[in-house]
Interface confidence: low
Amino acid sequence: IPVIEPSVPELVVKPGATVTLRCVGNGSVEWDGPPSPHWTLYSDGSSSILSTNNATFQNTGTYRCTEPGDPLGGSAAIHLYVKDPARPWNVLAQEVVVFEDQDALLPCLLTDPVLEAGVSLVRVRGRPLMRHTNYSFSPWHGFTIHRAKFIQSQDYQCSALMGGRKVMSISIRLKVQKVIPGPPALTLVPAELVRIRGEAAQIVCSASSVDVNFDVFLQHNNTKLAIPQQSDFHNNRYQKVLTLNLDQVDFQHAGNYSCVASNVQGKHSTSMFFRVVESAYLNLSSEQNLIQEVTVGEGLNLKVMVEAYPGLQGFNWTYLGPFSDHQPEPKLANATTKDTYRHTFTLSLPRLKPSEAGRYSFLARNPGGWRALTFELTLRYPPEVSVIWTFINGSGTLLCAASGYPQPNVTWLQCSGHTDRCDEAQVLQVWDDPYPEVLSQEPFHKVTVQSLLTVETLEHNQTYECRAHNSVGSGSWAFIPISAGAHTHPPDEFLFTP
């Protein structure tokens, strides 16, 4: 680190005095200080001498000596006061430019350290500082306004009390620039627009920025529109608004509209689409299949997408049967608006009961007329099975009835012993009935099928079981012939004697 002689941090001299500052280092050294007249510089390798024979108040300042070859970049400094009774201030710059929230140093250097107790900062013409101006003072550097604000862009003077009167410095202009974080913020309203030919329309493109220097324009299909610009300033931001008013829209007004704003930081753009139609429209659609199958006891949400202009004048969900005249509860229906012209309507059907199968219709109306979308809801049921012994055309026959949805498949099993369900070890024979007779197959109802098993001789120490299954589940019924007659055994029930 270089060494300065005299080896004091501060030196106070009178105007006209001779001042010699010597800096010595291991290698070559350099002086750096405020720009001021009358200094002479002598260098001889590892030492450098800064001297003046006629010090003035303008020589007041901090002089720093550095050793460029020092990898640690060490330096030494001495502060010189040239104590001029007529000039308490040495102003190093008359204009200071900072960005908002930076500290602004107003470089008025006190020429006499004794005056420090009576210094203050004022605006020109003796006006006081603005409220909330937070500042500090250093006799070596001047006044610092902390976290400067745009509104503090003013002309300032440094004041010192000398012999009971205030002596002002020349003025310093502070320019606090707003930090431009990026291109202007944009809004384009509406985000989408539909109008019938001949109707009026309005599109508003607005941009805002902390700085006034920005441009905004609205373009239609890449053609710039000549629209008068309204300007405003609020919430500490400059606003520029372009409003496109169309009294009677036609098809040539349709297309893509882009709102574009730019400043020196770059640009932002946002777009919207304007659709011009010949007449009102109302379109209903669903992403779901209109034919729904759900297991009884489960829940289902039916969703309809509506695209309409003008807006809906009415809508509702209706149950069209066939089981009852009940109507969906309003609390189970809700609507969500995706955007101005598209809506989603949902009907929630929790824990479906057998009587809730059937047709559900969503109806909507606007000036374009009525539209409806109908869902068909069929409930799935696991099979229910029953077996009886009867004679058909003189032959002993086991008759199995199975009811469920989808249509059940039927399998007959013959097994040894008396049991409520044949297990693998007991099975003697298995017959699949590929074509059971369909007894009933009404829409939205269970399908009932019947399967016949002709048995010439009933084996008394055996069980005959009818099993039915579909995609939902399975059911079975065991038939046990005993000497007293034929006995049937539904699952999970006690044996009974007819």
Epitope: D215, F217, K224, S258, N263, Q265, G266
Partner: antibody, heavy 118, light 108 residues
Amino acid sequence: EVQLVESGGGLVQPGGSLRLSCAASGFTFSGYAIHWVRQAPGKGLEWVSVISGYGSSTYYADSVKGRFTISRDNSKNTLYLQLNSLRAEDTAVYYCARDPGVGGFDVWGQGTLVTVSS
Amino acid sequence: DIQLTQSPSSLSASVGDRVTITCRASQSVRRRFLAWYQQKPGKAPKLLIYDASSLESGVPSRFSGSGSGTDFTLTISSLQPEDFATYYCQQYYPIPRTFGQGTKVEIK
């Protein structure tokens, strides 16, 4: 037809000055930021300066800051670049280019050659 | 400033070849604000692609752009005789606008 036509190039000595013009036609001039881009002989493209549509904002590359001044006269549909304190390294073809505000420079002039030599 | 580095600096290809040029940015390019230009000797540059992948009106569909962040690509799906030129990438946010050093596509 949308067009930009540069003029004003020529031979000038180091330290000298020159004023380039860029005449626009076929579009609403005041609605577009316009840039100057240059290309030294056999080299790549170098962005120089930009001025916003109404002339309220200007910006310069560090290599020309303090020496070049961009301006525009929207009543004449003309862009200008004042070149002062010219150096040999400023020798280039200077192009003006239109910024549509939505990406890239979509219209370029044919360029004008500035040669700085003693 | 954002520096753009193109690779390769030059390439030789034949008519019908698929050609890919890459452009790498020293820091992320905001919102894909990157353009590609074609320049033929003695002519002004011509805009091909903007916003990294949007094809400028009138540019043949064999040109395509892709990428985001710091890595971008220009692809010519089937090189035509009129495509032999120098190609530049350019970022246009923020100022200063900067260009890549260029990629010269020559006839093999």
